[in-house]
């Protein structure tokens, strides 16, 4: 048994980090294999996680940890019973996936306005509250074409554009994510889509 | 809230042993860290021990090495410090501590006073 | 002593002021700092941990910084009922154990 693909890890930043790895072959990641993870800290334990299989001979760990500050760094041991399979590190910090934001709602009632609101999916004590900026993507379900994305660079989660930049009478979508420059961070996921009518008046035409 | 209370502390003659305890509540103190500072009276905080969540890994200051003793009993969520051959510099507020990362919460002391 | 901080320091209702806390070339490379207040008559307190990150609770007028093996507290606004003792800590892997600076006692005059 060897590993393929050495582990990849990308932390949420706040309490989970993600490891993927691929196998030679086809495992039962959950009874073969164990990652152990340590902070590198004179008070901390090893602990133990159970990957899952993710495809064929793929495995993912979703490793637990209380808070993350830009300085910690994990040992990462990957067991096969008794064999060592692989040793390495992973500092968090270094390697960021936003968590995805959600509650995306889109308000209609504002005269001509369409506002888009969500929630930052960090806490107000968490470093990169104070720090996402967003992509909004909205598209048209009659219309493939109909694709835009707009950047939200203001802190406040949330998008105001003219009901009239869309078009009027048909169903429209939409998603949002988010990154940090601070961290040079991956985007995150996309939300879970929000659908809504657009329908507006026509300014009457001037003769 | 997390909570820390010390008690055990008081009066002994120099060569005597006390035995503190520091119970833990409003938190998994299975999960924690935990340690012992003092301070001595006028004096800065000096730290004593230190023992990791399971109680695999302790730490002794060296003033302390070879009389103190730290323990856990994570049953009774209860930190326990051990003083054997006891001089009068070892009077002080003895604080237990929680760990992570840091020293983040503290107990309101107990008072050790090494006296004939 | 392995951590060194001035014994006191001192500063008027408003103003800024600044601890350091400058560690000996026996401490590791690249030590992550603990500050600590303790108002008089009382338990000590965390402050800033791992450099400069405030726990909940901790106003934004204290930060903390680290250049290299020393550190430095700041405050800003001082008020009045920031009058205590302040003290700077590390993890010394070298000496398995946790260093503490003598302290700095603030005056808000």
């Known amino acids: 048994m060897k590993v393929l693909q050495e582990p990849t890890c990308v932390s949420d930043y706040m309490s989970i980090s993600t490891c993927e790895w691929k196998m030679n072959g086809p495992t039962n990641c959950s009874t073969e294999l164990r990652l152990l993870y340590q902070l590198v800290f004179l008070l901390s334990e090893a602990h133990t996680c159970i990957p899952e299989n993710n495809g064929g001979a793929g495995c993912v760990c979703h490793l637990l940890m209380d808070d993350v500050v830009s300085a910690d760094n994990y040992t990462l041991d990957l067991w096969a019973g008794q064999q060592l399979l692989w040793k390495g590190s992973f500092k968090p910090s270094e390697h960021v996936k936003p968590r995805a934001p959600g509650n995306l709602t889109v308000h209609t009632n504002v005269s001509d306005t369409l506002l888009l609101t969500w929630s930052n999916p960090y806490p107000p004590d968490n470093y990169l509250y104070n720090h996402l900026t967003y992509a909004v993507n909205i598209w048209s379900e009659n219309d493939p074409a109909d694709f835009r994305i707009y950047n939200v660079t203001y802190l406040e989660p949330s998008l105001r554009i003219a009901a009239s930049t869309l078009k009027s009478g048909i169903s429209y979508r939409a998603r949002v994510r988010a990154w940090a420059q601070c961290y040079n961070t991956t985007w995150s996921e996309w939300s879970p889509s929000t659908k809504w009518h657009n329908s507006y008046r026509e300014p009457f035409e001037q003769h | 809230e997390v909570q820390l209370l010390e008690s055990g502390g008081g009066l002994v003659q120099p060569g005597g042993s006390l035995r503190l305890s520091c119970a833990a509540s409003?938190?998994?103190?299975?999960?924690?860290?935990m340690a012992w500072v003092r301070q001595a009276p006028g004096k800065g905080l000096e730290w004593v021990s230190a023992?990791?969540?399971?109680?695999?890994?302790?730490y002794y200051a060296d003033s302390v090495k070879g009389r103190f003793t730290i323990s856990r009993d994570n049953s009774k969520n209860t930190l326990y410090l051990q003083m054997n051959s006891l001089r009068a510099e070892d009077t002080a507020v003895y604080y237990c501590?929680?760990?992570?990362?840091?020293?983040?919460?503290w107990g309101q002391g107990t008072l050790v006073t090494v006296s004939s | 002593s392995v951590l060194t901080q001035p014994p006191s320091a001192s500063g008027t209702p408003g103003q800024r002021v600044t601890i350091s806390c400058s560690g000996s070339?026996?401490?590791?490379?690249?030590?992550?700092f603990n500050w600590y207040q303790q108002l008089p008559g009382t338990a000590p307190k965390l402050l800033i941990y791992?450099?400069?990150h405030r726990p909940s609770g901790v106003p934004d007028r204290f930060s903390g910084s680290k250049s290299g093996t020393s550190a430095s507290l700041a405050i800003s606004g001082l008020r009045s009922e920031d009058e205590a003792d302040y003290y700077c800590?590390?993890?010394?892997?070298?000496?398995?154990?946790?260093?503490l600076g003598g302290g700095t006692k603030l005056t808000v005059l």
């Open positions: 800590g590390t993890w010394d892997y070298s000496l398995s154990g946790y260093v």
């Open positions: 023992i990791t969540s399971s109680g695999r890994s302790i």
């Open positions: 501590a929680r760990v992570h990362r840091a020293f983040d919460y």
């Open positions: 409003g938190f998994t103190f299975s999960r924690h860290a």
């Open positions: 791992a450099d400069s």
């Open positions: 070339a026996a401490l590791d490379l690249s030590p992550s």
